[in-house]
Interface confidence: low
């Protein structure tokens, strides 16, 4: 007997051969006898099967002896064996059809689990075995599910259904709603205007919901809500927003944050979450302020840093094109007595500049500038 | 001063895999991640995705999907980057490259890996 | 896919030219862009990161300006180790993607 499987909502053709090359008689049952199509000299004509209207043959192909079986629009219990009798004998043609839909909707938040479930007709023993778009290959029978999705788990899920030898391939959109950044750092030095990004790792037509930025200073003992907003189709309008500091927000996708100027009181982190509407959960993204101040008192030449920086990164002052005068891997730094020059406050990671501030050490009869 | 230290030169056979490593010596294996670019003759760069050595997670440039694995041995501080079903088009140099994460650069590369692909 | 399109793709020069690149983003990448040299048979070597900021020992002469989507490598005045050539990267967003290149040759 052979075996033919069909996918749920597809479009499946059963063949049936006749060893004439001609149009003869013809009929389709199924396995309880009761007939689905056959033809009449060359008319279509159509039993009493839960089939009518789905049910359909080719015509133009029964001249050359071939009378197929087209079922529309298959359905899980249109799995059954179904039998062509022609020239006195029966093919038999077993269909199996089945099914595989993700358990919710397939826009999924960064962490949410995804549950694919396998629909499948009675009997049936099939196996299925899912690769995500990052390649990663997961296995199972009625149900597979994937915790933890992360961002490259966006995209297309190729599914492979195996049973008596054949398989049948399902390919199933999944959007991982996440920001493109879990986090950022932004380096500034103080009075500079600071930009924060936030952009979104997806595209929807419509995207509604509400969002807000928390902010943890270092200096503060506890964080605070610097600005509320709601996202109407991908429009942006601001709900409530602190007085200090005075951020201004972008009105359009992606979110987007200025600061008017860095201030060592604004350095730390913080946390901006974002709430879609019908779906549960949050989107976070969080963002880092460090901020560096170089500063001459009297015979004192201090340099500074504020904010979350690792404990790797080097903060230095030098002279400009001279070897660093003082470089350690702390907060601040300062040189006593600095002799007259551009001095550079450099922050760095290896070698790399992360954020730098000069200052001019004039001759000791006068006062400082700051470029 | 970190160093990327590649493994020797490679010739395949169409349809086989090559698995190349990169040694990280001289620094933090963990902080950063590692990425791989790839080079073929006469051709620019192209990315085909990176590596977290602290955590395992990985992110392949979607040309690479399902053909491309990266894994890492934190304990003797290697990263390593597989590419399976090889076609002649896969003849280029492959490199690994310090990756400071996204919004940054590469700034220390590994000395390159011919991978010659032919039957 | 961010494409960033790299012009020219060669150029000829001589020794103490002032030489300009440029790279052009398919979007805003805000200041997400750095700029490599490679020389034959050698890795690249990070010149330009965050679109202007100087490479720790990479001489003064090469300078990076631009942010969204337009962006140069200058070069004030040639020398006969700049003979290269020369890729703009953007880090903006993964996939990370490199321009086509600049091959630097001696006029």
């Known amino acids: 007997k052979k075996v033919v499987l069909g996918k749920k909502g597809d479009t499946v053709e059963l063949t049936c051969t006749a060893s004439q090359k001609k149009s003869i008689q013809f009929h389709w049952k199924n396995s309880n006898q009761i007939k689905i199509l056959g033809n009449q000299g060359s008319f279509l004509t159509k039993g009493p099967s839960k089939l009518n209207d789905r049910a359909d043959s080719r015509r133009s192909l029964w001249d050359q002896g071939n009378f197929p079986l087209i079922i529309k629009n298959l359905k899980i219990e249109d799995s059954d064996t179904y039998i062509c009798e022609v020239e006195d004998q029966k093919e038999e043609v077993q269909l199996l059809v089945f099914g595989l839909t993700a358990n919710s909707d397939t826009h999924l938040l960064q962490g949410q689990s995804l549950t694919l479930t396998l629909e499948s007709p009675p009997g049936s023993s099939p196996s299925v075995q899912c690769r995500s778009p990052r390649g990663k290959n997961i296995q199972g029978g009625k149900t597979l599910s994937v915790s933890q999705l992360e961002l490259q788990d966006s995209g297309t899920w190729t599914c492979t259904v195996l049973q008596n030898q054949k398989k049948v391939e399902f390919k199933i959109d999944i959007v991982v709603l996440a920001f493109q950044k879990a986090s950022s750092i932004v380096y500034k030095k103080e009075g500079e205007q600071v930009e924060f990004s936030f952009p979104l790792a997806f595209t929807v037509e419509k995207l509604t919901g509400s969002g807000e930025l928390w902010w943890q200073a270092e200096r503060a003992s506890s964080s605070k809500s610097w600005i509320t907003f709601d996202l109407k189709n991908k429009e942006v309008s601001v709900k409530r927003v602190t007085q200090d500091p005075k951020l201004q927000m972008g009105k359009k996708l992606p979110l987007h944050l200025t600061l008017p100027q860095a201030l060592p009181q604004y350095a730390g982190s913080g946390n901006l979450t974002l709430a879609l509407e019908a779906k549960t959960g949050k989107l976070h993204q969080e963002v880092n302020l460090v901020v560096m101040r170089a500063t001459q008192l009297q015979k004192n030449l201090t340099c500074e840093v504020w904010g979350p920086t690792s404990p790797k990164l080097m903060l230095s002052l030098k002279l400009e094109n001279k070897e660093a005068k003082v470089s350690k891997r702390e907060k601040a730094v300062w040189v006593l007595n600095p002799e007259a020059g551009m001095w550079q406050c450099l922050l760095s990671d290896s070698g790399q500049v992360l954020l730098e501030s000069n200052i001019k050490v004039l001759p000791t009869w006068s006062t400082p500038v700051q470029p | 001063q970190v160093q990327l230290v590649q493994s020797g030169a490679e010739v395949k056979k169409p349809g086989a895999s090559v698995k190349v490593s990169c040694k990280a010596s001289?620094?933090?294996?963990?902080?950063?991640?590692i990425s791989w670019v790839r080079q073929a003759p006469g051709q620019g760069l192209e990315w085909m995705g990176r590596?977290?050595?602290?955590?395992?997670?990985?992110g392949y440039a979607q040309k690479f999907q399902g053909r491309v694995t990266m894994t890492r041995d934190t304990s003797t501080s290697t990263v390593y980057m597989e590419l399976s079903s090889l076609r002649s088009e896969d003849t280029a140099v492959y490199y690994c490259?310090?990756?400071?994460?996204?919004?940054?650069?590469?700034?220390?590369w590994g000395q390159g890996t011919t991978v010659t692909v032919s039957s | 896919d961010i494409q960033m399109t790299q012009s020219p793709s060669s150029l000829s020069a001589s020794v103490g030219d002032r030489v300009t690149i440029t790279c052009r983003a398919s979007?805003?990448?805000?200041?997400?862009l750095n700029w490599y040299q490679q020389k034959p048979g050698k890795a690249p070597k990070l010149l330009i990161y965050a679109a202007s900021t100087l490479q720790s020992g990479v001489p003064s002469r090469f300078s990076g300006s631009g942010s969204g989507t337009d962006f140069t490598l200058t070069i004030s005045s040639l020398q006969p180790e700049d003979f290269a050539t020369y890729y703009c990267?953007?880090?903006?967003?993964?996939?990370?993607?490199f321009g086509g290149g600049t091959k630097l040759e001696i006029k």
């Open positions: 490259a310090r990756d400071i994460g996204e919004g940054y650069s590469m700034d220390v």
């Open positions: 979007q805003s990448i805000r200041t997400y």
């Open positions: 590596i977290n050595p602290n955590s395992g997670n990985t």
């Open positions: 001289g620094g933090t294996f963990s902080s950063y991640a």
């Open positions: 990267q953007q880090s903006y967003s993964a996939p990370l993607t």
